[in-house]
């Protein structure tokens, strides 16, 4: 629909509260270093302007595009050049190049201080003193640290954040009530951010076709009773929503997401029997609920796939007439029958099928050529099954922390050039696949594990893209979206790597380690482990285990000592010497 004033249209559709929140998120995701107060000022100016356009859509500048209005506003920031350097050059460009320029400068790893959680009483006072500012600050801090966070979903998180404080700040034991809720929101938020980052990477690096294929597979698993035409409609609409959010068009994205949720709920009967509860909830909860809804039951009477996709004489005719539609139908039919497969596996099967048709439909006897195409699927299915089986056995044997350590060693040997903080972060997240997925029965393990690993490996890819240091990482990240995990799995020890010079400072520890949380202490130890492997990439598991066990004992001993600092200094020197001897450094 053509509207005289786009900003008025979105303000009316979304309402003032959501409009302001989404503009704040958009600005914070673009200008990640700007102080909170500056953003609030800009948002208020945009909101006042939007209100004038609601009152009179013909008013001056009301006909301008949102990119033009928001870009002009961002470019008024006085310290743009000093704070952002070359990003200031974006302001010399015209739309749409200016917006593209801002997008390219989004930083997945901004140099911002870690968010430290204040005391509960301090937070509750701040919440009561000015609830609106408190919640805006939450949106701002999350958005600037996660520049691709799915904006309408961040509104849902903020709603839960507010509910937690409303409830817990009145409780007898505020901390016992609030802290678990905040921990849950933090962990869910990180997961949500990472999942959305993969969607944006899929769209931006591999194009709309790649995203649509992912969506066909996932929605077909989730809604196996829905017709192909219905799934196709949902995929088209969902692609539009995510293209908008990934492109910084947050008002349009939130508006279209609400429309999609409305459509799904109005057409539940032809989509899924599992939507009833979701559709009774308010908008933000409804959209979240639909996005997380469990897979519907598969129709009982689904015929064999072979009839239409292998045995039919019309396979090449159907393929020639509409390649992507035919492949989409194949993917839909395969996915709805296989909720037990990961989406990336389904996409690999579809790619294999496509490659086979490309080759065989050129032949004089296509059927003779593609008759055995389904046999080619067997090794593709078995590879992730075997990998998950082996890794779940290892996880059950070691527990999460030691399983993470095994992955840290494995990945440091594969790509030792990658920065230590990135290796630690990524390997810790890879290791979480164990507690997240290995508890599931066989039928749910693969979709849980491999699709989660895709999300985590994408974190490695986006962090590495900022400062590329390894050709092997670049290759695995860029060649094929669906084969990233198999590509990394197939990497062996990098024989070209020149071991890092030994630096005693890297292995010098102080008494402050004793006051750290268990998680922070683990990170310290895992950082040391990565550095060890970088110094001695050929060290055996046994050697590394011995050194790490000695290290754990050293930390425990010194944290119990009366003079902790002296203990760390003296025993630390001994530990370094012993470790050097053990590893032959």
């Amino acid at each position: 629909d053509a509207h005289k004033s786009e900003v008025a249209h979105r303000f009316k559709d979304l309402g003032e509260e959501n409009f302001k929140a989404l503009v704040l998120i958009a600005f914070a995701q673009y200008l990640q270093q700007c102080p909170f107060e500056d953003h609030v000022k800009l948002v208020n100016e945009v909101t006042e302007f939007a209100k004038t356009c609601v009152a009179d859509e013909s008013a001056e500048n009301c006909d301008k595009s949102l990119h033009t209005l928001f870009g002009d506003k961002l470019c008024t920031v006085a310290t743009l050049r000093e704070t952002y350097g070359e990003m200031a050059d974006c302001c010399a460009k015209q739309e749409p190049e200016r917006n593209e320029c801002f997008l390219q400068h989004k930083d997945d790893n901004p140099n911002l201080p870690r968010l430290v959680r204040p005391e509960v009483d301090v937070m509750c006072t701040a919440f009561h003193d000015n609830e609106e500012t408190f919640l805006k600050k939450y949106l701002y801090e999350i958005a600037r640290r996660h520049p691709y966070f799915y904006a309408p979903e961040l509104l849902f998180f903020a709603k839960r954040y507010k509910a937690a404080f409303t409830e817990c700040c009145q409780a007898a034991d505020k901390a016992a009530c609030l802290l678990p809720k905040l921990d849950e929101l933090r962990d869910e938020g990180k997961a949500s951010s990472a999942k959305q980052r993969l969607k944006c990477a899929s769209l931006q690096k591999f194009g709309e076709r790649a995203f649509k294929a992912w969506a066909v597979a996932r929605l077909s698993q989730r809604f196996p009773k829905a017709e192909f035409a219905e799934v196709s409609k949902l995929v088209t609409d969902l692609t539009k929503v995510h293209t908008e959010c990934c492109h910084g068009d947050l008002l349009e994205c939130a508006d279209d997401r609400a429309d999609l949720a409305k459509y799904i709920c109005e057409n539940q009967d032809s989509i899924s029997s599992k939507l009833k509860e979701c559709c009774e909830k308010p908008l933000l909860e409804k959209s979240h609920c639909i996005a997380e809804v469990e897979n519907d039951e598969m129709p009982a009477d689904l015929p064999s796939l072979a009839a239409d996709f292998v045995e039919s004489k019309d396979v090449c005719k159907n393929y020639a007439e509409a390649k992507d539609v035919f492949l989409g139908m194949f993917l839909y039919e395969y996915a709805r029958r296989h909720p037990d497969y990961s989406v990336v596996l389904l996409l690999r099967l579809a790619k294999t099928y496509e490659t086979t048709l490309e080759k065989c439909c050129a032949a004089a006897d296509p059927h003779e050529c593609y008759a055995k195409v389904f046999d080619e699927f067997k090794p593709l299915v078995e590879e992730p099954q075997n990998l998950i089986k082996q890794n779940c056995e290892l996880f059950e044997q070691l527990g999460e922390y030691k399983f993470q350590n095994a992955l840290l060693v494995r990945y440091t040997k594969k790509v030792p050039q990658v920065s230590t903080p990135t290796l630690v972060e990524v390997s810790r997240n890879l290791g979480k696949v164990g507690s997240k997925c290995c508890k599931h029965p066989e039928a749910k393990r693969m979709p849980c594990a491999e699709d989660y690993l895709s999300v985590v490996l994408n974190q490695l890819c986006v962090l590495h893209e900022k400062t590329p240091v390894s050709d092997r990482v670049t290759k695995c990240c860029t060649e094929s979206l669906v084969n990233r995990r198999p590509c990394f799995s197939a990497l062996e020890v990098d024989e070209t790597y020149v071991p890092k010079e030994f630096n005693a400072e890297t292995f010098t520890f102080h008494a402050d380690i004793c006051t750290l949380s268990e998680k922070e202490r683990q990170i310290k130890k895992q950082t040391a482990l990565v550095e060890l492997v970088k110094h001695k990439p050929k060290a055996t598991k046994e050697q590394l285990k011995a050194v790490m066990d000695d290290f754990a004992a050293f930390v425990e001993k010194c944290c119990k000592a009366d003079d902790k600092e002296t203990c760390f200094a003296e025993e630390g020197k001994k530990l370094v010497a012993a470790s050097q001897a053990a590893l032959g450094l």
Epitope: K313, C316, K317, E321, C361, A363, A364, P366, H367
Partner: nanobody, 115 residues
Framework: EVQLLESGGGLVQPGGSLRLSCAAS????????MSWVRQAPGKGPEWVSA????????RYAETVKGRFTISRDNSKNTLYLQMNSLRPEDTAVYYC????????GSQGTLVTVSS
């Protein structure tokens, strides 16, 4: 939209010759193997001949082997069927198809062999 337009049919005496053409559009002709299929009055479709995308590999039904020759010109997006030594039993509607499909997606061209 895929379109296949056959031409070249007609009435011919037994022992005579005809050359059928099929002009293709709406898809990447040079990437697909093609076939000729025929349907005699009151009968089901019968595959006649096939050719791969490059024109190197050709196949024929036993009933036409040695008499018919399939060929293609990818620069013109056209498929051909040279029919020699025609017999009354070759009378049928001939149509071209993608791959080995026997479903009719076009009008076809009528070949009548009669004295």
């Amino acid at each position: 939209e895929v379109q296949l337009l056959e031409s070249g049919g007609g009435l011919v005496q037994p022992g005579g010759s005809l050359r059928l053409s099929c002009a293709a559009s709406g898809f990447t002709f040079s990437s697909f193997g093609m076939s000729w299929v025929r349907q005699a009055p009151g009968k089901g479709p019968e595959w006649v001949s096939a050719i791969d995308s490059g024109g190197a590999d050709t196949r024929y039904a036993e009933t036409v082997k040695g008499r018919f020759t399939i060929s293609r010109d990818n620069s013109k997006n056209t498929l051909y069927l040279q029919m020699n030594s025609l017999r009354p039993e070759d009378t049928a509607v001939y149509y071209c198809t993608i791959g080995r499909s026997t479903s009719r997606g076009s009008q076809g061209t009528l070949v009548t062999v009669s004295s």
